[in-house]
C-alpha cells in the first residue's frame, strides 16, 4: 500500500522526487535558505520519513518557517528601534541599537543588526554579540579657567568621578567606566584581602550626606611593584565593583590620559585634586573641595624630598609633583587615591594624570610638594587587568 | 538584559502540591520562538527537564512526570508557573527556570531549592 | 525516554585538550547542546545545535556531533574550565539531558 504523496511545505522541497511511494521508501524536506526546519517551536537538524506498512509516514510533515530572531536583546544604557518595520525579527529584518546620549557612546560596531538565517542577529563585522554602552569619561559641569586657586568648594557635576571610599581610613579614588575605581595602593591595601570591606560612595558632595549612590567591591589589585611600607613607588590600585553604576551628570568616569596627554601635563600645566581630606584647619572637609595646582619640575620636586626624613629615591619615575613652591595649595590625609585631573583641550575631555600618593607631613609647606602617582605609567597594566577581569 | 528568576516554597511536605514562579525580564513571552523551560537538579545529579511553554502556548511535559506537572503563563506580569502535585522527598532538587531559544536553552535562572520533608 | 551517556569524568592537564562524549541513539540526526555547570552555580549554555557558540564563550570551546556521538572539545584548557558539563537533545518535543561528565584540571 503505497503512502500519500508528500507535498512539501511551503517554502521546503521534498527529496528524492518519486512518483509513488511503497514500504521502506523515505523522503527528506530541505527548506530554502532563510527557513529553518520546525517541529513545533523546536529546531530540526534534518527531516526523514519512512513510508510503513500500513500506508502512512513515519512521522507528521515539518514546517520550513521563516527564520524568526525573535524580539532583540535589551541593550544595557541602550535602546533598540525596529528598521524594517514595527516587531519584525524575521530572516534580513534590520534593527539598530543606539546608546542613551550624553553618558554613553557605542563600541564594537555600528549597531546595525540583520537577522541571519542561523536564526541570531548579527551585525555587519558578523558579530552576534550585543554591541556595547560604553560611558563617555571625563564630562565636568566645570570648565578650567587656567588660574591657580584652592581650597573651592566643588558644585554638583564638577567632579562626577569623584569617589569616596570608607571602610579603614577616609580615602578617595575615581571611577573608570562604569564598575571599576583607580585608587592609591596604600589607600586600599589593608582590604587586598578583604573587598568586601570597602564601602564605596559616589555621587555625592557632602563626605557625611545619606544621600549617594553606594557601590560594593568584588575585587581589589594591587600593583606588583609596590611594597607596604617601603616607600611609595608603582602606589596604584584597581578596585573592581560588583555592579555597574549609572552613568549621570553626578556620576561619571574620567578618563584614562591618552598617548598624547603628556604635552598637557607639563611643567607648570594646571592639574585639579579634589577631595575631603584634612583642610587647613585641620579637619576632614564635609564638602568635597578642591585645588588647582600647578605641575612642578620633577628635578626640583626630587630635590625637595632628598633630604632627611626623607631616603634618597624617594620620588621616582613613576611620580609627578605639583604645588606652589610659596606653599598653601595641596592634597592632604584623606584626599589619598584621588585623581589629579587635566582637561585634554583636544578632545574637551578630563583625564586623570596622578593620584594623590604622599607628601609631606605638614601638607602644603612651602618647598614641598604634593607627589603623585604618574597613571600614563601604568596604562598597559590598567587595561591588562580591566580586560582580564 | 535577559534575567529570570524563580521564587516559591523553599519546604514543602510530602503530598502536597509546589507551586514555582518564574519572572522573566529583558525578552517577550508572547513574540517570537522564545519558550521557557523547567528544570531540575536533586543534590549531587544530574539535570533533569521537566516542562517547557512557548509563546505559542505549545506546552510539552517530562512523559514520567506528565500527570503531576501543570506548566501556564501569564504575558502581563512576565510570569511562567510550575505546578506540581504530589511532592515526594525525591523530589526534593533545585529546580530552575530558563530560556529556550534556536533549542538551546541559553538563560537560566539562578535556582531555587526546595525541599520536600514532613 | 532516550538515555545520553556521558563518562563520569575527565582529567586534563592546563593547556591540553579535554574531549567529552555524548552517546545516544542516531544522536547526530539531532541538534546537541551542551552546558557548562560550576559547583554552587546555573548551567551556562556553551555550544548550541552541534558546533555553534554563544556570544561570550572563548573560542576553545568546540563541538561536533554525527552518529551516534557528540563531542565537546575544550582545546587548551584552562583552571577555569574545571566544571561539570552535560549535553542535551530533544526527542520530539521532550528534552533530554546527559548523565554529566566531571572535567578536572590537574
Known amino acids: 500500500q503505497p503512502c500519500p504523496y508528500p507535498m512539501a511545505p511551503p517554502n521546503g522541497h521534498v527529496s528524492p522526487v518519486q512518483a509513488k511511494y511503497i514500504l521502506k521508501d523515505s523522503f527528506s524536506i530541505f527548506c530554502e535558505t532563510g527557513y529553518e526546519l520546525l517541529q513545533g517551536h523546536l529546531p530540526l537538524k534534518s527531516f526523514t520519513a519512512v513510508c510503513q506498512k500500513d500506508g502512512s509516514w513515519d512521522r507528521p510533515m515539518p514546517a520550513c518557517s521563516i527564520v524568526d530572531c525573535g524580539p532583540p536583546d535589551d541593550l544595557p544604557s541602550g535602546r533598540v528601534e525596529y528598521i524594517t518595520g514595527p516587531g519584525v525579527t524575521t530572516y534580513k529584518a534590520v534593527i539598530q541599537y543606539s546608546c542613551e546620549e550624553t553618558f554613553y557612546t557605542m563600541k564594537v560596531n555600528d549597531g546595525k543588526y540583520v537577522c541571519e538565517a542561523d536564526g541570531f542577529w548579527t551585525s555587519s563585522k558578523g558579530e552576534k554579540s550585543l554591541p556595547v554602552c560604553e560611558p563617555v569619561c571625563g564630562l565636568s559641569a566645570r570648565t578650567t579657567g587656567g588660574r591657580i586657586y584652592g581650597g573651592q568648594k566643588a558644585k554638583p557635576g564638577d567632579f562626577p568621578w569623584q569617589v569616596l571610599i570608607l571602610g579603614g581610613t577616609t580615602a578617595a579614588g575615581a571611577l573608570l567606566y562604569d564598575n571599576w575605581v583607580l585608587t592609591a595602593a596604600h589607600a586600599v591595601y589593608e582590604q587586598k584581602h578583604d573587598a568586601s570591606a570597602l564601602d564605596i560612595r559616589m555621587g555625592t558632595l557632602k563626605r557625611l550626606s545619606p544621600h549617594y549612590t553606594q557601590a560594593w567591591s568584588e575585587a581589589v589589585f594591587i600593583h606588583e611593584g609596590y611594597t607596604h611600607d617601603a616607600g611609595f613607588d608603582n602606589d596604584i590600585a584597581l578596585i573592581k565593583l560588583n555592579n555597574k553604576v549609572v552613568i549621570n551628570s553626578n556620576i561619571t568616569p574620567i578618563c584614562l590620559p591618552r598617548k598624547e596627554a603628556e604635552s598637557f601635563m607639563r611643567t607648570d600645566d594646571i592639574g585639579t585634586a579634589s577631595g575631603w581630606g584634612l583642610t587647613q584647619r585641620g579637619f576632614l572637609a564635609r564638602n568635597l573641595m578642591y585645588v588647582d595646582i600647578p605641575i612642578v619640575d620633577h628635578q626640583k620636586c626630587t630635590a625637595a624630598y632628598e633630604k632627611p626624613p626623607y631616603p634618597r629615591g624617594s620620588v621616582t619615575a613613576n611620580m609627578l609633583c605639583a604645588g606652589l613652591e610659596s606653599g598653601g595649595k595641596d592634597s592632604c590625609r584623606g584626599d589619598s587615591g584621588g585623581a589629579l585631573v587635566f582637561l585634554d583641550s583636544e578632545t574637551e575631555r578630563w583625564f586623570v594624570g596622578g593620584i594623590v600618593s604622599w607628601g609631606s607631613m605638614n601638607c602644603g609647606e612651602a618647598g614641598q610638594y604634593g607627589v603623585y602617582t604618574k597613571v600614563i605609567n601604568y596604562i598597559p597594566w590598567i587595561e591588562n587587568i580591566i580586560s582580564d577581569f | 538584559q535577559v534575567t529570570l528568576k524563580e521564587s516559591g516554597p523553599v519546604l514543602v511536605k510530602p503530598t502536597e502540591t509546589l507551586t514555582l514562579t518564574c519572572t522573566v525580564s529583558g525578552f517577550s513571552l508572547s513574540r517570537g520562538k522564545m519558550g521557557v523551560s523547567w528544570i531540575r537538579q536533586p543534590p549531587g545529579k544530574a539535570l533533569e527537564w521537566l516542562a517547557h511553554i512557548f509563546s505559542s502556548d505549545e506546552k510539552s511535559y517530562r512523559t514520567s512526570l506528565k500527570s503531576r506537572l501543570t506548566i501556564s503563563k501569564d504575558t502581563s506580569k512576565n510570569q511562567v508557573v510550575l505546578t506540581m502535585t504530589n511532592m515526594d522527598p525525591v523530589d526534593t532538587a533545585t529546580y530552575y527556570c530558563?530560556?529556550?531559544?534556536?533549542?538551546?536553552?541559553?538563560?537560566w535562572g539562578q535556582g531555587t531549592l526546595v525541599t520536600v520533608s514532613s | 525516554q532516550p538515555v545520553l551517556t556521558q563518562p563520569p569524568s575527565v582529567s586534563v592537564s592546563p593547556g591540553q585538550t579535554a574531549s567529552i562524549t555524548c552517546s545516544g541513539d542516531k544522536l547526530g540526526d539531532k541538534f546537541a547542546y551542551w552546558y557548562q555547570q560550576k559547583p554552587g552555580h546555573s548551567p551556562v549554555l556553551v555550544i548550541y545545535?552541534?558546533?555553534k557558540r554563544p556570544s561570550g564563550i572563548p573560542g576553545r570551546f568546540s563541538g561536533s556531533n554525527s552518529g551516534n556521538t557528540a563531542t565537546l572539545t575544550i582545546s587548551g584548557t584552562q583552571a577555569m574550565d574545571e566544571a561539570d558539563y552535560y549535553c542535551q537533545a530533544w526527542d520530539s518535543s521532550t528534552a533530554v539531558f546527559g548523565t554529566g561528565t566531571k572535567v578536572t584540571v590537574l
Open positions: 530558563a530560556r529556550i531559544r534556536a533549542g538551546g536553552i541559553d538563560y
Open positions: 545545535q552541534d558546533n
